[in-house]
Interface confidence: medium
Amino acid sequence: EVEKTACPSGKKAREIDESLIFYKKWELEACVDAALLATQMDRVNAIPFTYEQLDVLKHKLDELYPQGYPESVIQHLGYLFLKMSPEDIRKWNVTSLETLKALLEVNKGHEMSPQVATLIDRFVKGRGQLDKDTLDTLTAFYPGYLCSLSPEELSSVPPSSIWAVRPQDLDTCDPRQLDVLYPKARLAFQNMNGSEYFVKIQSFLGGAPTEDLKALSQQNVSMDLATFMKLRTDAVLPLTVAEVQKLLGPHVEGLKAEERHRPVRDWILRQRQDDLDTLGLGLQG
């Protein structure tokens, strides 16, 4: 806590500028008006304040806005954002995507901090759903963002937002998450033709039921092994040898490499040996 002391004569700040870097902490506290700071927040980032000086500036804003900062200030926090605690951020009402982008930019290249997680949570809750633009922004900064959400949170993602999802955004999703996302993707891409549809839906197939895999097997899709290995075991088990052969196309030869791993191992055990033999891969049920 900085002591309340009078500002020395002639030191009262008329604007936020570089001269303030020479102010001691107590001088900043005494000589910088909080309202001036709030209106000129955009200048703070251009000035090489020390961490201790930034603490003083934060303290002044906290005093001015005890109920939480207005968005006009939040948007220009810049590196001061790194000084905020999750408790501070919970008081905010962030509605502008530009504000969100500006603050994510500050944390760019780092792991998602508790502050960022709280900010995103506040933003999404404020919007009521994860719309496409928000999802685009969040996955650009944090490719694993989507898979960090619970199935319940994912249920608020509208199908239209699925267009913003890239394959790498789903890399760390577990089957429960894909179970939620797959029906949305199916709805989002339903008007695409066969081959284009498969390219788009491929990343989501870890949530696909058996009947959809059977339908895909009739469309000559040539699914690659990486995709096949991510399918739900319970969805793969009822597939016939002929259906798997059609689903994988030439990649069926790769089943040999995967015969000891799920879902291939479990699927093999469900098949008649005569049927497996038709593949010519030496698979033993």
């Epitope: 000559n220 040539s222 030869e253």
Partner: antibody, heavy 115, light 107 residues
Framework: EVQLVESGGGLVQPGGSLRLSCAAS????????MHWVRQAPGKGLEWVAY????????YYADSVKGRFTISADTSKNTAYLQMNSLRAEDTAVYYC????????WGQGTLVTVSS | DIQMTQSPSSLSASVGDRVTITCRAS??????VAWYQQKPGKAPKLLIY???SLYSGVPSRFSGSRSGTDFTLTISSLQPEDFATYYC?????????FGQGTKVEIK
Amino acid sequence: EVQLVESGGGLVQPGGSLRLSCAASGFNLYSYSMHWVRQAPGKGLEWVAYIYPYSGSTYYADSVKGRFTISADTSKNTAYLQMNSLRAEDTAVYYCARGYGMDYWGQGTLVTVSS
Amino acid sequence: DIQMTQSPSSLSASVGDRVTITCRASQSVSSAVAWYQQKPGKAPKLLIYSASSLYSGVPSRFSGSRSGTDFTLTISSLQPEDFATYYCQQSYYWLFTFGQGTKVEIK
């Protein structure tokens, strides 16, 4: 006996086109995938394109996408690689290879792109 | 795209030597890795598929193994006809990718 024989290589100017053929014998092209793989002089192998005639699926390396087209005529048991907008960096020996495991290869045909 | 990083790029060995060539995938490719041998002016020949399965007609001195994303081709006792360039290749994802090659030369 399985055999793959490539043809159609030669000298072509930058921006020009060539069509390579891969005549297959000893197996039914319809039920096997086919690849084109190339090797620039003194360099390593680079996968170029793939077709599975059974399904019509095709895939391409990023370096040739939009310029090269792979196709197959199962009645002639022959795979093709249509190469348009050729560049100097496409100069290489082009091989066709059979199957997911690339178990059989042709002898290769040289494509030289030069002005 | 998946990168297959092969090492060494070349090695010198004598007849009878045990030779090991490694290939590291930039991400998991399971066991879907093949090894090929190529001699100057000739087409490549398949030696190993599915990381460790010996292709028919290939001498048993050739073997393949996998440890996570690391793949190894071993020639237990180098023969005169084994001096060539060796390539690994993954077929787990489109697009198929080859390693940059290892040239095995006579010491």
